[in-house]
């Protein structure tokens, strides 16, 4: 005998109590695939979690974190505390980046400043806890008497038009 449940679309469940009739998912539940024998309970975004997308009969609710926190884990299962720029979250809380490192976001770890000399460049703007260094031209390019990066335009004899 053919399983009538396979005909039940997403948003419904196969009701065995009613001769395998496809019944709509009850309020606050959903089925994201066809042929389901039960509907799943919708996720509720409470507390530190706020609703990003409401639950529908065919898809679960999606949560986000309130201001001051950011999502972690699959489907935002956790909200991690934000730190300030120039800090990182450690086992003991938000700590300032050590000298020579920076973090320009409210999450993640402090990263070392770029080493400009590895690319043969010089430091144009010093790094801070919140910002990486800005590398500029190589030191040789900046030394007095060094040839300019763009050669001067060739001089023309007066009265002659360019060829």
């Amino acid at each position: 005998l053919q399983d009538l449940c396979s005909n039940c679309p997403a948003g419904t469940f196969c009701d065995n109590n009613r001769s395998q009739i496809c019944s709509p998912c009850p309020p606050n539940s959903f089925s994201s695939a066809g042929g389901q024998r039960t509907c799943d309970i919708c996720r509720q975004c409470k507390g530190v979690f706020k609703t990003r997308k409401e639950c529908s009969s065919t898809s679960n609710a999606e949560c986000d974190c309130i201001s001051g926190y950011h999502c972690l884990g699959a489907e935002c299962s956790m909200c991690e505390q934000d730190c300030k720029q120039g800090q990182e979250l450690t086992k003991k809380g938000c700590k300032d980046c050590c000298f020579g490192t920076f973090n320009d976001q409210k999450r993640g770890i402090c990263r070392p400043w770029t080493n400009c000399s590895l690319d043969g460049k010089s430091v144009l703007v010093n790094g801070t806890k919140e910002r990486d260094v800005v590398c500029g031209p190589s030191p040789a390019d900046l030394s007095p008497g060094a040839s300019s990066a763009t050669p001067p335009a060739p001089a023309r004899e007066p009265g002659h038009s360019p060829q």
Epitope: G47, V48, F49, G68, Y69, L72, G73, S77, M78, C79, E80, Q81, L89, K91, K92, G93
Partner: nanobody
Framework: QVQLVESGGGLVQPGGSLRLSCSAS????????MSWVRQAPGKGLEWVSD????????FYEDSVKGRFTISRDNAKNTLYLQMNSLRAEDTAVYYC?????????????????WGQGTLVTVSS
């Protein structure tokens, strides 16, 4: 090892107050968010309240907002739930629970340690 021990439950009349405590040990209490969760007779688990690691951010289930207050004393490694204006529907076993990651608030499914619970009965 991590231990969470609740106390303070009991029988109280409607409109009355109770203060639950949860004594924590075996982990750096001040680095973890904590929660209260309850289970009414014959019902499933219901999230009640969260508090972040430092105690400055608190969150509540709508039905207890304005009546319950979660707090913590990190020096004493203790979590509290002050329950005022109690109703019959607040009757439940109340559990305290620890969140799994430092400075992170998780969903109830992810709490990694739970206490044994304390029974609160609201009845005249």
């Amino acid at each position: 090892q991590v231990q969470l021990v609740e106390s303070g439950g009991g029988l109280v009349q409607p409109g009355g107050s109770l203060r639950l405590s949860c004594s924590a040990s075996g982990f750096t209490f001040s680095s973890y968010a904590m929660s209260w969760v309850r289970q009414a007779p014959g019902k499933g688990l219901e999230w009640v309240s969260d508090i972040n690691s430092g105690g400055e951010s608190t969150f509540y289930e709508d039905s207890v907002k304005g009546r319950f207050t979660i707090s913590r004393d990190n020096a004493k490694n203790t979590l509290y739930l002050q329950m005022n204006s109690l109703r019959a529907e607040d009757t439940a076993v109340y559990y305290c629970a620890k969140h799994p990651l430092t400075f992170t608030i998780a969903t109830m499914n992810d709490y990694d340690y739970w206490g044994q619970g304390t029974l609160v009965t609201v009845s005249s």
